[in-house]
């Protein structure tokens, strides 16, 4: 039962994490204009991996995509790649883990196969989470470096634009979403790997043997000695229902009233 719970929880945590990684990758607020000197501004700039936006006091938001590939900084390309790899690995991991779930019966799939699939998906989740954390951390490092650059023609590392010192960028909401989501995916992956150890068929059942001692009619039944893995109870041959736990992948965005791309 504990193995199923661990596996199910690992799946749910990873699902939330991957949804968060997808949300972070799509978000425009990777870097936002630093408002330390001017808390309320008539023009507010923020940038994502795919486009940069300007929100005016008027309520209008204008977003422009980075319509160049070669003109973009290598660091930005690297972050994009890490996030996409994280999403792809996570998505494959989710697909694999669905079939590996102990509560789902697919034909006559052996527990050993389910254990292998659980381990595979766990490793995929771990790598996916690490990719997301690495991507967000690289971007954050890029921001910190640029923030302290005091030269007038400071290179932002975003879309190859030259900007004046007055516009500095700080951490956007997407970075925190990415870090948390990456962490959740990583935790989910670890839980899947732990669950895999409990799923592995390590039982050695010895059949009862009758010993006939002279003058006595006593049967000794050594019984089924179990090679325990030390991880939870063995739930083999029990049909388990987890109440059909669902997760709702709802990535909420708060659009401005006018979003002109």
């Amino acid at each position: 039962m504990a193995v199923t719970a661990c596996q199910g929880l690992g799946f749910v945590v990873s699902l939330i994490g991957i949804a968060g990684i997808i949300a972070a990758t799509c978000m425009d607020q990777w870097s936002t204009q630093d408002l330390y000197n001017n808390p309320v501004t008539a023009v507010f700039n923020y940038q994502g991996l795919w486009r940069s936006c300007v929100r005016e006091s008027s309520g209008f938001t204008e977003c422009r995509g980075y319509f160049t590939l070669l003109g973009l900084p290598a660091m930005l390309q690297a972050v994009r790649a890490l996030m996409i790899v994280g999403i792809v690995l996570g998505a494959i991991g989710l697909l694999v883990s669905i079939f590996a779930l102990k509560c789902i019966r697919i034909g006559s799939m052996e527990d050993s196969a389910k254990a292998n699939m659980t381990l595979t998906s766990g490793i995929m989740f771990i790598v996916s989470g690490l990719c997301a954390i690495a991507g967000v951390s690289v971007f954050a490092n890029m921001l910190v470096t640029n923030f302290w650059m005091s030269t007038a023609n400071m290179y932002t590392g975003m879309g190859g634009m030259v900007q004046t010192v007055q516009t500095r960028y700080t951490f956007g909401a997407a970075l925190f979403v990415g870090w948390v989501a990456g962490g959740l995916t990583l935790i989910g992956g670890v839980m899947m790997c732990i669950a895999c150890r409990g799923l592995a068929p390590e039982e050695t059942n010895y059949k009862a043997v009758s010993y006939h001692a002279s003058g006595h009619s006593v049967a000794y039944k050594p019984g089924g000695f179990k090679a325990s893995t030390g991880f939870g109870s063995n739930t083999k041959n029990k049909k388990i229902y987890d109440g059909g736990a669902r997760t709702e992948d709802e990535v909420q965005s708060y659009p401005s009233k006018h979003d002109y791309v």
């Epitope: 008539a42 023009v43 940069s52």
Partner: antibody, heavy 118, light 113 residues
């Protein structure tokens, strides 16, 4: 057709308070920020502040904080500016203006003349 | 606060003449995010509210005659009227739309000779 209809001229005593209204029509009231501008002696233009009718969010010129209070009534598509503790310095024409692209004010009310005199 | 300085304070012209007026800001009005200058030009005739002519320093408002042209970037801006008409006689104001508080220039008065 976009129209901003302001309330009529006012003659008020020093120390009193008053409220100017600006009724919007011909567009989605909550979709555009409303600004208020003061024009003294038919020359100097001064930005008082703005209000976002969608959420009631405001930004004021520090100079007018405590002097002007901006509010909106979404149901009647009307913006209000209350002027507090009036002095002769507050005698001017006050305009409401809709803000559009580039933070530019594309439509203006006809103006409300306020005269502070005892 | 950003200070907007307009020059000259008044201009006396004849109909058909080309006119340029200047507006300087104490800080750059160029926004790096979209490479746009947040400067607006208004025209005000006596007894009327200001009328929007140009925003983003050079974008003409719909319905504004093409004889009105805005130019400049950063801190130096110019409004040009290619051929002044009698109906253009008014006061012209520039405005900072980039940083709070939004500020106006003192205006340039266009008068007929």
């Amino acid at each position: 057709e976009v129209q901003l209809q302001q309330s009529g001229p006012e003659l008020v005593k020093p120390g009193a308070s008053m409220k100017i209204s600006c009724k919007a029509s011909g567009y989605s009231f909550t979709g555009y920020t409303m600004n208020w501008v003061k024009q003294s002696h038919g020359k100097n233009l001064e930005w008082i502040g703005l209000i976002n009718p969608y959420n009631g969010g405001t930004s004021y010129n520090q100079k007018f904080k405590g002097k002007a209070t901006l509010t909106v009534d979404k149901s009647s598509s009307t913006a209000y500016m209350e002027l507090l503790s009036l002095t002769s310095e507050d005698s001017a024409v006050y305009y409401c203006a809709r803000m559009n692209y580039g933070n530019a004010m594309d439509y203006w009310g006809q103006g409300t003349s306020v005269t502070v005199s005892s | 606060d950003i200070v907007m300085t307009q020059s000259p304070s008044s201009l006396t012209v004849t109909a058909g003449e080309k006119v340029t007026m200047s507006c300087k800001s104490s800080q750059s009005l160029l926004n790096s995010g979209n490479q746009k200058n947040y400067l607006t030009w208004y025209q005000q005739k006596p007894g009327q509210p200001p009328k929007l002519l140009i925003y983003w320093a050079s974008t003409r408002e719909s319905g504004v005659p093409d004889r009105f042209t805005g130019s400049g970037s950063g801190t130096d801006f110019t409004l040009t009227i290619s051929s002044v008409q009698a109906e253009d006689l008014a006061v012209y104001y520039c405005q900072n739309d980039y940083s709070y508080p939004l500020t106006f220039g003192a205006g340039t008065k266009l008068e007929l000779k």
